[in-house]
């Protein structure tokens, strides 16, 4: 009710002889500040005196008198809130009731606190979770209902008397609600901790033992098993017997079922602690274990690897890689199931035993066509030799070999012939599928690998073929050696270097560009007349009569070829000049007379000069001299001179007679 003082503190405090006690305490007085405080031990109310009797442990009065006991007991409070007390050291006879007598100006109050002091340090208390399972982390708690500032203590964890490695977390509480020291240890128990003793040990600041609490761990775990095998190395031969025994070294709770597994799969009808395998076969090789279950779950033993040894099985050959390209590398692998693994191998190529090849692998760094064929092997171990399997085929692929171009025609080949060539090869893998020819031409391929050249040209010198599968192999070019008549025959003037003048020495050469065969004959002709049979035609002193159209012919065993006609031109000064008169050399006066200066010249006359009988040059310079009308006095002898680039020529005199007309005669 409202007439009560309000106090807060632990109901009971615990300590032991020689330790100390710290009493956390708060209060609220009914009115005003605290004026007087007395700490009683086991106070009793005296009705007669209306006062409390008992041992006074501490007294605080207005006059300030404090008994000697006050050195052990301390009031750490104040006049309005705090009533905390400390007793140091605390003694066994301090056990009982502590009475806090509080007086203010108008009110009084007696507050009671229980103190339990034991003769020796009391043990802490270990708290465990309700169930502990292997490998699951748990927290172990050690609780001691004691804490005092003046008396440091420590709690240590031990497993089977040995300090535990795990770090513990210690906490203390000194509050009006509770006073304790607590240590918490996080711990993952293993099955092997089952039944082990855990201790929480109370020690003083120097590590001196004060007290302890112990518990026995009850760690739930799956069955722990040991497997034993006879023979102990678990290596047997086909037909032998094997016994495996499963022993339970620990189980909590008790086991319920047993089974056996091979390579992780349960063996049917094997539910006892002994597994008997009679007359084992190689298929029974594998990893065996036993499995025993309890309420926690199944436990498995370690695996026993049972090796049933047997001679190698028939071998197979693996080729990396087939088909193989010539020049590449290839590896053969001999595969044979055997136990123990084969120690020796025998290799065969096309059924013949290969020497010096006794490894599991055969490596060929650079494959050649001769490596092709069937490869087989035999494996051998301590128990015997296997059988040779079917083998594997190595296919070596390569370009066509020894390719040749062959001329099918009878020799020699003449220009214009039809030539047939074939492309031959020695071997090829894969097969030849096509052929190529060089140079390219509009030629026929009547069948695969055959080339037909119709009307072969004189200049078809060489032909090469290639036989192709995945690759093309070229043959060396073959010379057709086509024979033909001389070609490009022409006449060439060797001398003189400039134009030919009459009287010059002249040489003509009969040239040709090529001839096969090379042996040739020459023929010169002019106007169908044979002039010579040498390559040159020579004139010591050329005359205008030698001018004309010349041809030369060149002959070989294939045929003859003529040059184009070549015109020989001879340059000479005007010659054979004469004056011709028209209408005649007798003309009647008054008529017209034409004198023409005729000549033979090369080049033609470019300039004419006329002269009279007095060798007087006339003012006329053309080829014709026209007199119109002609007069009697024109009668007389005339001559002309012709000029060209070579020189001059003159005609003999020609006489013109002009007679009188009848009219003139009549007038006379």
């Amino acid at each position: 009710d409202s007439s009560k003082w309000v106090f807060e503190h632990p109901e009971t405090l615990y300590a032991w002889e020689g330790a100390c006690v710290w009493i956390p305490c708060t209060y609220r007085a009914l009115d005003g500040d605290l004026e007087s405080f007395i700490l009683f031990h086991n106070p009793e109310y005296n009705k007669n005196t209306s006062k409390f009797d008992g041992t006074r442990l501490y007294e605080s009065t207005k006059d300030g008198k404090v008994p000697s006991e006050q050195k052990r007991v301390q009031f750490l409070g104040d006049k309005n809130k705090n009533c905390t007390l400390s007793i140091h050291p605390v003694h066994l006879n301090d056990s009982g009731q502590l009475g806090l007598r509080m007086e203010s100006k108008t009110e009084k109050w007696m507050e009671r606190i229980h103190l339990n002091v034991s003769e020796r340090p009391f043990p802490p208390h270990i708290q465990l979770p309700p169930e502990i399972q292997e490998s699951q982390e748990v927290t172990l708690t050690c609780l001691l209902n004691f804490s005092c500032y003046g008396y440091p203590i420590q709690l240590q964890w031990l497993l089977e008397g040995v300090p535990m490695r795990q770090a513990a977390v210690t906490s203390t509480s000194l509050t009006i609600k509770s006073v304790f020291t607590r240590s918490e240890l996080k711990f993952s128990p293993q099955w092997s901790h089952h039944g082990k003793i855990v201790t929480c040990q109370l020690q003083d600041a120097d590590g001196k033992f004060l007290s302890n609490d112990t518990v026995q761990l009850n760690v739930k775990h799956t069955p722990k098993l040991e497997i034993k095998v006879t023979p102990s190395d678990a290596i047997v031969r086909e037909g032998d017997s094997v016994t495996m025994t499963c022993e339970v070294s620990s189980s909590n709770p008790e086991y319920t079922t047993v089974s056996w597994l091979k390579d992780g799969t349960s063996l049917k009808k094997q539910n006892t602690f002994t597994l008997n395998l009679r007359e084992v076969t190689k298929d029974q090789s594998g990893k065996y274990c036993c499995q025993v279950s309890n309420d926690v779950g199944p436990g498995r033993s370690e695996e026993v690897f049972l090796q049933v040894q047997y001679a190698p099985e028939p071998s197979t050959v693996q080729i990396l890689h087939s088909p193989a390209v010539e020049g590449s590398q290839v590896e053969f692998l001999c595969m044979s199931l055997a136990n123990p693994l084969p120690t020796n191998y025998t290799w065969y190529h096309n059924g013949k035993e290969m020497q010096g090849r006794t490894e599991e692998k055969v490596h060929i760094p650079k494959i050649l066509p001769w490596h092709a064929g069937t490869y087989s092997c035999v494996a051998e171990n301590i128990l015997g030799t296997g059988q040779r399997g079917p083998g594997a085929e190595l296919d070596v692929q390569y370009p066509p070999k020894k390719v040749t171009t062959v001329i099918q025609n009878p020799m020699p080949i003449r220009e214009g012939d039809t030539v047939t060539l074939s492309c031959n090869y020695n071997s090829s893998n894969p097969s030849v599928t096509r052929y190529e020819w060089k140079p390219h031409g509009a030629w026929e391929e009547p069948s695969l690998g055959v080339l037909k050249i119709q009307n072969v040209g004189w200049d078809n010198t060489t032909i090469a073929c290639a036989a192709c599968n995945s690759w093309c192999s070229w043959a060396s070019p073959v010379a057709l050696n086509v024979q033909y008549a001389p070609r490009d025959v022409r006449v060439r003037k060797i001398k003189p270097l400039s134009e030919i003048h009459s009287g010059n020495s002249v040489s003509l050469q009969c040239d040709f560009s090529s001839s096969h065969p090379k042996e040739v004959q020459f023929f010169w002709e002019k106007n169908g007349r044979l002039l010579g049979k040498e390559s040159q035609l020579n004139f010591d002193s050329i005359s205008p009569e030698d001018a004309g159209s010349y041809s030369c012919w060149v002959n070989n065993s294939i045929g003859q070829t003529a040059s184009k006609a070549w015109t020989l031109e001879v340059l000479y000064a005007p010659r054979r000049l004469r004056v011709s008169m028209s209408p005649g050399d007798q003309v009647m006066e008054g008529k017209s007379a034409t004198l023409t200066c005729e000549s033979d010249a090369n080049p033609p006359v470019s300039h004419y000069t006329w002269f009279d009988w007095n060798n007087q040059s006339l003012p006329y310079h053309s080829q014709k001299l026209r007199l119109e009308p002609v007069k009697v006095q024109h009668s007389g002898a005339y001559w002309c001179q012709g000029t060209n680039s070579v020189g001059k020529g003159r005609s003999p005199l020609s006489t013109l007679t002009v007679y009188y007309s009848p009219e003139t005669i009549g007038r006379r």
Epitope: H349, K352, M354, Q355, G356, P365, K366, W370
Partner: nanobody, 122 residues
Framework: QVQLVESGGGLVQAGGSLRLSCAAS????????IGWFRQAPGKEREGVSC????????YYADSVKGRFTISRDNAKNTVYLQMNSLRPEDTAVYHC???????????????WGQGTQVTVSS
């Protein structure tokens, strides 16, 4: 094109020695078998000796072991067969052969030479 040319054959008395040579050309691999086989008139071909070019390992027919030695001169591309303690039964045409492997019956006879006559008189 592989070409093998043998030389060094001849007539020798029993207990004598001969050295056969085989000049090889045209082999495009560094790893091949080369060796000797022999053929006597009316008899089966018999492998005599073989060696691998890659590692120089050598093999001999039981009938010539300890008497014949195969060797090579890489620089000259030549293989030799040194024949000691010759016997009349060694009389045969000796062929040099090259191939992929040494076989128990001799070299893999992919390519072989014309042979050289060895006659051992008693």
């Amino acid at each position: 094109q592989v070409q093998l040319v043998e030389s060094g054959g001849g007539l020798v008395q029993a207990g004598g020695s001969l050295r056969l040579s085989c000049a090889a050309s045209g082999i495009t691999s560094d790893d091949y078998a080369i060796g000797w086989f022999r053929q006597a008139p009316g008899k089966e071909r018999e492998g005599v000796s073989c060696m691998y070019s890659s590692d120089g390992s050598t093999y001999y027919a039981d009938s010539v072991k300890g008497r014949f030695t195969i060797s090579r001169d890489n620089a000259k591309n030549t293989v030799y067969l040194q024949m000691n303690s010759l016997r009349p039964e060694d009389t045969a045409v000796y062929h040099c052969a090259a191939g992929p492997w040494c076989f128990v019956t001799g070299v893999g006879r992919e390519e072989w030479g014309q042979g050289t006559q060895v006659t051992v008189s008693s």
